[in-house]
Interface confidence: low
């Protein structure tokens, strides 16, 4: 006997209780492929989530995060609180980057400044909480006429002794 369920299009399900009739998905559910025996419950974008695309009978809802949050995970499965540039998110909320680290985004963690000397270069622009240092040419690259130029001192914050 031919399986009549294979004829059921997306947006319907094969209702075994009704002689394999293709029944439309109930409200707040969907089937994205044909031949389904059940419809999936639509995702609910609530709380920190807001609806980017409404659920339809053939496709799931898609969520974004409300203002002040950003998406994490596949299909925005989580929302994480935004921080300011120069901060990172910890268990206790947004905290300023420690001296010697920076974060130039509203998300993610503070990362160490680039160590210019590892590449044989000098610090051209000091780092801040929000910005990495800018490395300049190595002293050997400087022309004799420019060799008297003093590279900027490493960035230092109040309360920190030079490292």
């Amino acid at each position: 006997l031919q399986d009549l369920c294979s004829n059921c299009p997306a947006g319907t399900f094969c209702d075994n209780n009704r002689s394999q009739i293709c029944s439309p998905c109930p409200p707040n559910s969907f089937s994205s492929a044909g031949g389904q025996r059940t419809c999936d419950i639509c995702r609910q974008c609530k709380g920190v989530f807001k609806t980017r695309k409404e659920c339809s009978s053939t496709s799931n809802a898609e969520c974004d995060c409300i203002s002040g949050y950003h998406c994490l995970g596949a299909e925005c499965s989580m929302c994480e609180q935004d921080c300011k540039q120069g901060q990172e998110l910890t268990k206790k909320g947004c905290k300023d980057c420690c001296f010697g680290t920076f974060n130039d985004q509203k998300r993610g963690i503070c990362r160490p400044w680039t160590n210019c000397s590892l590449d044989g270069k000098s610090v051209l622009v000091n780092g801040t909480k929000e910005r990495d240092v800018v490395c300049g040419p190595s002293p050997a690259d400087l022309s004799p006429g420019a060799s008297s130029a003093t590279p900027p001192a490493p960035a230092r914050e109040p309360g920190h002794s030079p490292q």
């Epitope: 409200p27 707040n28 639509c42 609910q44 974008c45 609530k46 709380g47 920190v48 989530f49 807001k50 609806t51 409404e54 809802a61 995060c65 409300i66 203002s67 002040g68 949050y69 994490l72 989580m78 929302c79 994480e80 609180q81 935004d82 998110l89 910890t90 268990k91 206790k92 909320g93």
Partner: antibody
Framework: EVQLVETGVEVKKPGASVKVSCKAS????????MHWVRQAPGQGLEWMGI????????SYAQKFQGRVTMTRDTSTSTAYMELSSLRSEDTAVYYC???????????????????????WGKGTMVTVSS | QSALTQPASVSGSPGQSITISCTGT?????????VSWYQQRPGKAPKLIIY???TRPSGVSNRFSGSKSGTTASLTISGLQAEDEADYYC??????????FGGGTKLTVLG
């Protein structure tokens, strides 16, 4: 005792702004979302918006977008609702109401308000009249 | 976002049961199990009596019960008492990350 204490009566002229405060006590202020709801004389309840006192993020009813600003001061456990460009139809009692849900998780961000308003302030009567 | 639809008034005699309906759409009442009911007496702030469609907060009489079918939620008050006379409001979460209230229902206890 868990309670929300709002400012008293406010009388404003059309075009002005009003800032209503709501001081929370008896619970951890940053652990519960706060809603603002208003009620015009003889009329029903109208949801205005919600603020997460932990991060300060907000979501406003479309009707009030651009006119309402919800803020909070965690040091005093106080939520604020400011409504600008007042008109006579803004005459109403303005309530702050705590959301029943608890337990914001910074790592997942998956804290969702329940939408049940379990603790209400007594309301601030705002009259807009020329 | 339109207000949820409630009857303007209902009435009943002491001891009777009454039901107040709250009709929305698939974007609010029909789409979520986040329907709440509030009792408001004159000059007072609203009081939560039902949330999550059927759940009663502690301290609320078991004479109050909630249910939902499709896009309509209902509040039933059994064994009606004079003190139940008040305005009743439903509210629901919506797919726009907002909440919406019903227009309110005035309950009159006869006799």
């Amino acid at each position: 005792e868990v309670q929300l204490v709002e400012t008293g009566v406010e009388v404003k002229k059309p075009g002005a702004s009003v800032k209503v405060s709501c001081k929370a006590s008896g619970y951890t202020f940053t652990s519960y979302y706060m809603h603002w709801v208003r009620q015009a004389p003889g009329q029903g309840l109208e949801w205005m918006g919600i603020i997460n006192p932990s991060g300060g993020s907000t979501s406003y009813a479309q009707k009030f977008q651009g006119r309402v600003t919800m803020t909070r001061d965690t040091s005093t456990s106080t939520a604020y609702m400011e409504l600008s460009s007042l008109r006579s139809e803004d005459t109403a009692v303005y309530y702050c109401a705590r959301d029943l849900g608890e337990g914001y998780d910074f790592w997942s961000g998956y804290y969702t308000p329940s939408g049940a308003f379990d603790i209400w302030g007594k309301g601030t009567m705002v009259t807009v009249s020329s | 976002q339109s207000a949820l639809t409630q009857p303007a008034s209902v009435s009943g005699s002491p001891g009777q049961s009454i039901t107040i309906s709250c009709t929305g759409t698939s974007s609010d009442v029909g789409g979520y199990n986040y329907v709440s009911w509030y009792q408001q007496r004159p000059g007072k702030a609203p009081k939560l009596i039902i949330y999550d469609v059927t759940t009663r907060p502690s301290g609320v009489s078991n004479r109050f019960s909630g249910s939902k079918s499709g896009t309509t939620a209902s509040l039933t008050i059994s064994g009606l008492q004079a003190e139940d006379e008040a305005d009743y409001y439903c509210s629901s979460y919506t797919s726009y990350s907002t909440w919406v209230f019903g227009g309110g229902t005035k309950l009159t206890v006869l006799g």
